[in-house]
Interface confidence: medium
């Protein structure tokens, strides 16, 4: 099918444009022009005829087209006007006409664009600013830029007039930035200059320094007022309410007592006509005053505050003391003293921080001691505590559970059952319980300063049966002598009876076997290897009685003195020496030889064979336990004489 | 023996309601929970509620709030669930349940005693 | 709400071969030294049948082939060996809070 392709689409003005002729039939007469969207001969630019390769210009010829033999057409210098629809009339050899339209729209090249403003000056948090991207063009597209960036979305933005116009409500300091215009259509973009906003803001509340407030007599008072405002404001200081001078600094050499008072500085914006005032009062001593503490934070949460203690007030070439419980300052890597001893400094302030701190203030004769702090360290909730801690109870009973939970200020209680809140109460009664009160139990405690909460989750069952029990233990694998061990019966029933059975007989009586926990708990001291048994405990009631599975205690032992055999110590010359060595131990020992103190194999058995009296010598064997840590050894002197010297030796192995 | 007996199938209305049956033998309906469980065609469980026939405390799932109604009457022993304005999605196999005898461990949501189940076909 | 997601949602295997089901809990079911995870055997036509609970712990009258583990978010149930009559959908249901049933594993046997 017979198509026009613009080349380009948007075309500059002043450029040129090729309307490309795809799928051209063949065997053609010849064609032509027209601009529109018909073929009107009114409006023929240009027509060919292929037989002569003749061109005709028509009625719209401008003298800026040229025809191609391919049909296509470049129209050059292109102006306004151009923009729309062109039309190629086709006409085949068989005189059958084709006919497609293209077209094309022409842009003007976008000038440089310049912003103008209506208010150079503007005051902050009175004035608005509206910034206007010039000149107004049609069909162009405006965009804006703050320091090079797209604008922030802010409710004080706000663009109008096709976005040409900018406008900044209520202008802040922060508005004091870089702004550009960019002009774009689909042929051209252009930015503008960047223009500065200088807003006027100030003075604010000017700053007076040093901070310190505290002088001696005899000292130099310098003091330096400072307040942001733009322009830069104007100073004036007043002492007591009259005025000394029009400079930012203060300075008054070597002050007595009688400089004591009110020190106003007074910043003043000559642009926004605006004045503020800070007050300061020094005070000037003759003798180091009684110091006092200040803190940065009254109530400081556990683990995420610092608190900053400083004794006031400051003095200069002065020695600042610290005390803390009465005692002076622990070494530790919390607590930090600023250089000159006047800021003590508690890292993440823990419960324990509480205090009291003193400071002290030490002159020629004397240390001076502030009143003693106590800080009120927020913490918690630890992890509550639910009791009592049974887990089984008979129906029909009374079901009272507390909750507690260390905290400051004290904790606010809440009880779920099955993830339904119930109350907020550090208490929960339910009387008469029957089965269908069984269920998870959950105390969450919540610390309302912090606003940090912790819960514990307890499982109750309401039942006339006793569970099969089981044993825990504190220690899976003791060592003989060394260790004791805890087992204890669990769950935790109410109104049970506890019993022990040590391998299937009742406990025995013995100064290293103690019950406690109401018979609960079972504790074997310095264990022996004999102790290696299986434990049973049972519960019962008036309704039922279980026992539990046996655990069998693993004792570690050993090892033991190591025993060599067979006995013999004399061989004859020629027999093959077959030494084994044994040691009682849990788990079983690590064995190893030395002959005359030479390291030898690593093995139970040691085997020569055909010895000669070149091994006469010490045979060792060291045993060692690798869980229990301990080593042991033993020595056997061998004899080896030559064949038939003496009556009575072994003929060997 | 311990049985939970279900009424028979229901063919209802869009937009109707249906009141179906759940009545225990072997056992007091009062101390246990009733639970109400959907089972859509070729779908798995959901559980919409309990009540606890004793006092008629009753909780129900999120989803089924407004949906069912749970309620019980314990000289029959016998526990209700009613679903109204019923739409093609209701359409399901409704099984009561309960915590039954056969453990002491602890914990009122674990079933080991169904009914055999309600068909409810909600037709337009 | 604690989403339960099971997996498979369907297994073949062969008869006295293993088969192992998966459920992942969106947070923990574990509290107070229990884990609340409870498995259910289900056979076309008929109601749900209670195998596991608490876990692990195998409920009366149920063969000792079938068994369960796990803690916290993430819990298992083993069949072996599997027989012809295991055939059937298989759910976990937790009761840490409000209950809530996995979308169901089916098992066939070749």
């Known amino acids: 099918k017979l198509t026009i392709e613009s080349t380009p689409f948007n075309v500059a003005e002043g450029k040129e444009v090729l309307l490309l002729v795809h799928n051209l039939p063949q065997h053609l007469f010849g064609y032509s022009w027209y601009k529109g969207e018909r073929v009107d001969g009114n409006r023929q630019i240009i027509g060919y005829v292929i037989g002569t390769q003749q061109a005709t210009p028509g009625p719209a010829y401008s003298g800026r087209e040229i025809i191609y033999p391919n049909a296509s057409l470049l129209i050059q210098n292109i102006i306004q006007n151009d923009t729309g629809f062109y039309t190629l009339h086709v006409i085949k050899s068989d005189l059958v006409n084709e006919e497609a339209t293209g077209q094309f729209r022409v842009y003007p090249e976008l000038p440089k664009p310049s912003i103008s403003s209506n208010n150079s000056k503007p005051v902050e948090d009175k004035d608005a600013v509206a910034f206007t991207c010039e000149p107004e063009t049609q069909d162009a597209t405006y965009l804006w830029w703050v320091n090079n960036q797209s604008l922030p979305v802010s409710p004080r933005l706000q663009l109008s007039n096709g976005n040409r116009t900018l406008t900044l409500f209520n202008v802040t300091r922060n508005d004091t930035a870089s702004y550009k215009c960019e002009t774009q259509n689909p042929v051209s973009a252009r930015r503008s200059d960047s223009v500065i906003l200088n807003v006027l803001y100030g003075p604010d509340a000017p700053t007076i320094s040093p901070l310190n407030t505290s002088y001696r007599s005899g000292e130099n008072l310098n003091l330096s007022c400072h307040a942001a405002s733009n322009p830069p404001a104007q100073y004036s200081w007043f002492v007591n309410g009259t005025f000394q001078q029009s400079t930012q600094e203060l300075f008054i050499p070597n002050i007595t007592v009688n400089n004591s008072g009110s020190y106003t500085c007074q910043a003043h914006n000559s642009d926004t006509g605006l004045n503020r005032t800070t007050v300061t009062t020094i005070t000037v001593y003759a003798e180091p005053p009684k110091p006092f503490i200040t803190s940065n934070n009254s109530n400081p949460v556990e683990d995420e505050d610092a608190v900053a203690l400083t004794c006031e007030p400051e003095i200069q070439n002065t020695t600042y003391l610290w005390w803390v419980n009465n005692q002076s300052l622990p070494v530790s890597p919390r607590l930090q003293l600023s250089n000159d001893n006047r800021t003590l400094t508690l890292l993440s302030v823990t419960r324990n921080d509480v205090g009291p701190y003193e400071c002290g203030i030490q002159n020629e004769l004397s240390v001076d001691h502030s009143d003693p702090v106590i800080l009120n360290v927020l913490y918690g909730p630890d992890d509550p505590t639910i009791s009592p801690s049974y887990t089984y109870y008979r129906p029909g009973v009374n079901l009272s559970l507390s909750c507690h939970a260390a905290s400051n200020p004290p904790a606010q209680y809440s009880w779920l059952i099955d993830g339904n809140i119930q109350q907020h109460t550090q208490e929960l009664f339910i009387s008469n319980i029957t089965e269908k009160n069984s269920g998870l139990y959950t105390c969450q405690a919540n610390n309302s300063a912090s606003g940090h909460s912790r819960t514990t989750v307890k499982t109750i069952t309401v039942s006339a049966e006793l569970p099969k029990p089981s044993i825990s233990s504190n220690n899976s694998k003791p060592v003989e002598d060394k260790d004791a061990v805890a087992f204890t019966c669990e769950p935790e029933a109410q109104n049970t009876t506890y019993l022990w059975w040590v391998n299937g007989q009742s406990l025995p009586v013995s100064p290293r076997l103690q019950l406690s926990n109401g018979n609960r708990t079972l504790t074997l001291f310095n264990v022996t290897r004999n102790d290696a048994r299986a434990y049973v405990c049972g519960i019962q009631n008036s309704v039922s009685a279980n026992r539990s599975d046996p655990v069998t205690l693993d004792v570690l032992y050993g090892p033991d003195t190591p025993i060599i055999s067979p006995p013999d110590s004399s061989y004859l010359s020629g027999a093959n020496l077959n030494l084994s060595c044994h040691s009682a131990s849990n788990p079983s020992p690590q064995y190893s030889w030395r002959i005359n103190g030479i390291p030898q194999q690593h093995t139970q058995v040691l085997f020569i064979a055909k010895i000669t009296p070149n091994n006469n010598g010490t045979y060792a064997c060291f045993v060692s336990n690798l869980a229990t840590g301990r080593n042991n050894s033993i020595v056997k002197s061998i004899t080896v004489s030559a064949s038939g010297t003496s009556p009575g030796l072994s003929a060997g192995a | 023996e311990v049985q939970l007996q279900q009424s028979g199938a229901e063919l209802v209305r869009s937009g109707a309601s249906v009141k179906m049956s759940c009545t225990a033998s072997?056992?007091?309906?009062?101390?246990?929970?009733m639970h109400w469980v959907k089972q859509r065609p070729e779908q798995g469980l959901e559980w919409i509620g309990w009540i606890d026939p004793e006092n008629g405390d009753t909780e129900y799932a999120p989803k089924f709030q407004g949906k069912a109604t749970m309620t019980t009457d314990t000289s029959s022993n016998t526990a209700y669930l009613q679903l109204s304005s019923l739409t093609s999605e209701d359409t399901a196999v409704y099984y009561c349940n309960t915590r039954g005898l056969s453990t002491m461990i602890t914990t009122r949501w674990f079933f080991d005693v169904w009914g055999a189940g309600t068909t409810v076909a909600v037709s337009s | 709400d604690i989403v339960l997601t099971q997996s498979p949602a369907s297994l073949t295997v062969s008869l006295g071969l293993r088969a192992t089901i998966s459920c992942r809990a969106s947070k923990s079911v574990s509290a107070s030294g229990y884990s609340y995870m409870h498995w259910y055997q289900q056979r076309p036509g008929q109601p749900p049948k209670l195998l596991i609970y608490l876990a692990s712990n195998l409920q009366s009258g149920v063969p000792a082939r079938f068994s369960g583990s796990g803690s916290g978010t993430d819990f298992t149930l083993n069949i072996h060996p599997v027989e012809e009559e295991d055939a059937a959908t298989y759910y976990c249901?937790?009761?840490?809070?409000?209950?809530?049933f996995g979308g169901g594993t089916k098992l066939e046997i070749k």
């Open positions: 072997g056992f007091n309906i009062k101390d246990y929970y």
């Open positions: 249901q937790h009761s840490r809070e409000l209950p809530t």
